[in-house]
């Protein structure tokens, strides 16, 4: 079983603040109480949980850094989604900060790809067509809205 198999709920169905755990687990948007008897809702805009869990606390929502824009807010079942501001990008090998895109290509090269939040401009040599920069990093996996299940390793 991989985490790929476990799709979280985008927004938990309306529930009371407390419900009972199922096999010791609480659904997305909740955490377990210290005595293990209740599932307690995460606080909207403050914390979240994307998966079935037995966490004693929900996870703290990410705050977008300066230089980032908030694409979607934190809900009880999904963390904040931040994206680099226009004209900047986040590299795969330094994901902690947004870097300025280059304004143009070096001499003898031509631009074939624009600046995006995930990649710098892409330049190729005029004659050979070989790339000057690395591959464009993949965009983060898309969140689906199908509910998560309390899956676990099987013997």
């Amino acid at each position: 079983i991989t985490q790929q198999d476990l799709a979280p709920q985008q927004r938990a169905a309306p529930q009371q603040k407390r419900s009972s755990p199922s096999e010791g687990l609480c659904p997305p948007g909740h955490h377990i109480s210290e005595d293990g008897r209740d599932c307690i809702s995460c606080k909207y805009g403050q914390d979240y949980s994307t998966h079935w869990n037995d966490l004693l606390f929900c996870l703290r929502c990410t705050r977008c850094d300066s230089g980032e824009v908030e694409l979607s807010p934190c809900t009880t079942t999904r963390n904040t989604v931040c994206q680099c501001e226009e004209g900047t990008f986040r590299e795969e090998d330094s994901p902690e900060m947004c870097r300025k895109c280059r304004t143009g290509c070096p001499r003898g090269m031509v631009k074939v790809g624009d600046c995006t939040p995930w990649s710098d401009i892409e330049c190729v040599h005029k004659e050979s067509g070989t790339k000057h920069s690395g591959e464009v990093p993949a965009v983060e996996e898309t969140v689906t809205s199908s509910p998560g299940t309390p899956a676990s390793p099987c013997s």
Epitope: I1, T2, Q3, Q4, L6, A7, P8, P21, E23, G24, L25, I32, E34, D35, G36, R37, S49, T50, H51, W52, N53, D54, L55, L59, R78, N79, V81, E140, E141, V143, G148, P150, A151, S152, P153, C154, S155
Partner: antibody
Framework: EVQLVESGGGLVQPGGSLRLSCAAS????????MSWVRQAPGKGLELVAA????????HYPDTVKGRFTISRDNAKNSLYLQMNSLRAEDTAVYYC??????????????WGQGTLVTVSS | NIVLTQSPDSLAVSLGERATINCRAS??????????MHWYQQKPGQPPKLLIY???NLESGVPDRFSGSGSRTDFTLTISSLQAEDVAVYYC?????????FGGGTKVEIK
Amino acid sequence: EVQLVESGGGLVQPGGSLRLSCAASGLPFNSYYMSWVRQAPGKGLELVAAINSNGGRIHYPDTVKGRFTISRDNAKNSLYLQMNSLRAEDTAVYYCTRLTYYGNPAWFAYWGQGTLVTVSS
Amino acid sequence: NIVLTQSPDSLAVSLGERATINCRASESVDIYGNSFMHWYQQKPGQPPKLLIYLSSNLESGVPDRFSGSGSRTDFTLTISSLQAEDVAVYYCQQSYEDPLTFGGGTKVEIK
């Protein structure tokens, strides 16, 4: 305060058997995944077995599958590891752990002090 | 199985200086905005202790000189100002996929 206390380790011959126990206190034992993690002398860490809160879901890596059996007694707040057909490579400190679940068994929140199992003739 | 490769194998850092430990996964451990990577500290003669979970969340009671960062395949544990009590072996661990696996460990010593 969470406490996990292992017992049952010792010296055993290759092909022999041993049963480890873990007594848990300070947590609602019947609510949590539990597991055994081992560490061979001077080596790294390896998950040996994991079990969910009611014993209905169990996981073993290929290295121990068919030889080791994890079980629990929630009424006694106890976790067990039955080890059969022991090999020299099973020599390690065996830790009882509380395994946090997040979409899958995820990280090891609490650890016991460990019990040493030595397989040697 | 996902293989975790830690670097360096050992690290000597002066007291008060920054220590940086890297962990590279053989495939991405990210999904739905979470990175399923965790960090532990093991002092000589003691069991491991959880420091960081889900890449960057500091476990309760762990000093804030410890921090975790990274995503997809590349992760870093940073000790911002090394203290004598930080001498230990540090392990990363992934829970993206079964079986759960650990890195080989990085030994941190005082220079």
